[in-house]
Structures are given as C-alpha cells and as structure tokens.
Interface confidence: low
Amino acid sequence: ATKAVCVLKGDGPVQGIINFEQKESNGPVKVWGSIKGLTEGLHGFHVHEFGDNTAGCTSAGPHFNPLSRKHGGPKDEERHVGDLRNVTADKDGVADVSIEDSVISLSGDHCIIGRTLVVHEKADDLGKGGNEESTKTGNAGSRLACGVIGIAQ
C-alpha cells in the first residue's frame, strides 16, 4: 500500500492531520483524519494544484483539475480531481474526516502527492450554486488551513 500524510496549518486556530492510503494503484484512496479550530458546520475540502505554500495557502493555486472539468461534488462525473467533499465541524470545532475516493490517486496522472490540501472557510456548494464561481470553487470562501501532501512510511 502507498501512504501519504498532510499536516494542515493556517494563520488562525485551524490545524489538522490527514492520512491517505491506497492499497492498489488503480484502487480507491482512503482519507481519514481530524481538523480542529473550525467554526461549527460545513467546510469545503479540496486538493489544490501546487505544492507551493510560500505565500501561505493562496500560492497553492486552483483546485487540482488535470481533466479541465468544472467543479462538482465527489460523486459527480463533472468534477475536479481535487474535489473531495465538505467536512463537518461539530460544536467544538472538530471535523472528522472519513472519505474513500476513487478519483484521486497516490500515483499516476491523478497523483495528489506533492500538491496542497486545503480546508475552506465556508461550505462547498458542490457546483450547484448557480453562478460562475460555483463551477470553479464551489463558493467555499477563503483558505483557512493547508498543507502539502507528502509520502508517509
């Protein structure tokens, strides 16, 4: 199995640790972890194109989208590779992350290793917001915390 890990950090209180595991190169990727310091409710959760955090989370670029598609939800045919889903923070500001995704990969063309994982300020409308921004970012707002996805032992 291939494993990866990402430590999420931002300017504010949001931080987290996210693990990735892929048993077979064409198989699904299991994503699990925890994020704390969030406001209660939904927060967009995406892989962005660049592993560049030199200017904070903004330098990570747009959603990872090697197929040049519109933004969508994780189960949509029309989605960015980096479109995971919303994570839900409870009243303590902690979000449980438990995802299995068959579009991202830890190898090949859809490899997310070396790219940036971002948790956003607001809920991702999953491309259903009815405006142009919805088809790009899901109107998920600012980038609260991010981290480069790296190979784990």
């Epitope: 925890s34 994020i35 839900t88 409870d90 902690v94 979000a95 995802i99």
Partner: antibody
Framework: QVQLVQSGAEVKTPGASVKVSCKAS????????ISWVRQAPGQGLEWMGW????????NYAQKFQGRVTMTTDTSTSTAYMELRSLRSDDTAMYYC??????????WGQGTLVTVSS | DIQMTQSPSSVSASVGDRVTITCRAS??????LAWYQHKPGKAPKLLIY???SLQSGVPSRFSGSGSGTDFTLTISSLQPEDFATYYC?????????FGQGTKVEIK
C-alpha cells in the same frame, strides 16, 4: 444533545451470533463514523473496528476479521454490530462510540453480552 | 499493530495531589493520541484529543502533552470524582489500540 442509546443485555450460547444496536441522536448521523469497543471482565478497552456512516467503509481489527460485521441504517440513525461464532471469551461489555477524527467523543451506555453454555 | 504502554498501572493519591500518567507508543504516532476516563458501570469519557486538546466540558485541571512516542496526562489537583481508570488510545494507524489502563485509587 448528542446521545447514543444501545440495545439491552444479551445471553448467548457458544457458536451463536449477537447483534447489538446503537441509536444516535442530537447530531447529523452521516457526518461521523461509529466505532465499537469492548471490555471483558477485569480487562482493558479493546477496539473492534469502525464504520464510516457516510459511505459504509469499514475497518475491522484483525482479531475480529471474518467474525464481525458493522452496518448502519441512516433512515433510523442506527448502527449495528454483529459478532458471530461466539465463544466464552467474547463475554464483555460492548460499547458504540461516535468516531471523531482520531478519538471517540460520545459513547453509548454499553451492552453486556454473556456467552455461556 | 502499535503497542501502547501506560505507566504506572495504578497510583494511590490523595485529594489535591498532582497526578501524572505516561503513555508510550511502540512507534511514532505524531499527535494521534486521546485520553479517556472510565468509571465502573459507566461509559468511558473523552478527556483529551490530539494529544493536548481539552475536550469541551472537561475541567481544566486535566491536561495532555507529548508528541511522537511519549505522552503525558496530568491532573493538576486531584478531586474526589477523578478516582477512575485512565486509558490512552492511538489513532495513527489501524487498528486503533489502547494502553492497558492506569487505575487512580484513593490513598
């Protein structure tokens, strides 16, 4: 407030199966996983596995692989844990707990399963 | 599987004492550690998550520290309701595993 309410105590014979239920309320059921933990008499806590309510992904401890099945019913916000081929050393208090990242923040009251011939 | 070793296995203390419980992981678990309090006939209660974050509603006399392989739970001033068994639990990799428990008893 968040609550997990488990089914009542069970007495089973060796070789039988038991199915424990765990009804959740006070939060969005699909946003968190459910873990199952047991404690045998005089022993410590033992993690059995968990299920992601969002997509039914399960991860079982090797010790229980092939003998345990964890399921959920989102229409009733209920999680289930079935343990088959029961042995006397499966006698324990079984707990469900809400999985939140790397911890379990709310727990059911426990279900005592006694395996005896 | 990752082994979690707690010490001591039991401790006798008086009300007002400072109590420290340690937990050692058999390999690096980053900050993936939680602490629970368990009283007979009751469900376990989460005290600390991600090694050092205090669960809401838990008194501030409880604190957690550590990273990597060595972790500590401290009760700064033991109260009568704190006599219980305490468990650490790692979540760095599956299966999640618990320490064997530390029983805090009245001296």
């Amino acid at each position: 407030q968040v609550q997990l309410v488990q089914s009542g105590a069970e007495v089973k014979t060796p070789g039988a199966s038991v199915k424990v239920s765990c009804k959740a309320s006070g939060y969005t059921f699909t946003s968190f996983g459910i873990s199952w933990v047991r404690q045998a008499p005089g022993q410590g806590l033992e993690w059995m596995g968990w299920i992601s309510v969002y997509n039914d992904y399960t991860n079982y401890a090797q010790k229980f692989q092939g003998r345990v099945t964890m399921t959920t019913d989102t229409s009733t916000s209920t999680a289930y844990m079935e343990l088959r081929s029961l042995r006397s050393d499966d006698t324990a208090m079984y707990y469900c707990a809400r999985k939140r990242g790397g911890d379990m923040d709310y727990w059911g009251q426990g279900t005592l399963v006694t395996v005896s011939s | 599987d990752i082994q979690m070793t707690q010490s001591p296995s039991s401790v006798s203390a008086s009300v007002g004492d400072r109590v420290t419980i340690t937990c050692r992981a058999s390999q690096d678990i980053s900050s993936w550690l939680a602490w629970y309090q368990h009283k007979p006939g009751k469900a376990p209660k989460l005290l600390i998550y991600l090694a050092s974050s205090l669960q809401s509603g838990v008194p501030s006399r409880f604190s957690g520290s550590g990273s990597g392989t060595d972790f500590t739970l401290t009760i700064s001033s033991l109260q009568p309701e704190d006599f219980a068994t305490y468990y650490c639990q790692q979540a760095n990799s599956f299966p999640w595993t618990f320490g064997q428990g530390t029983k805090v008893e009245i001296k």
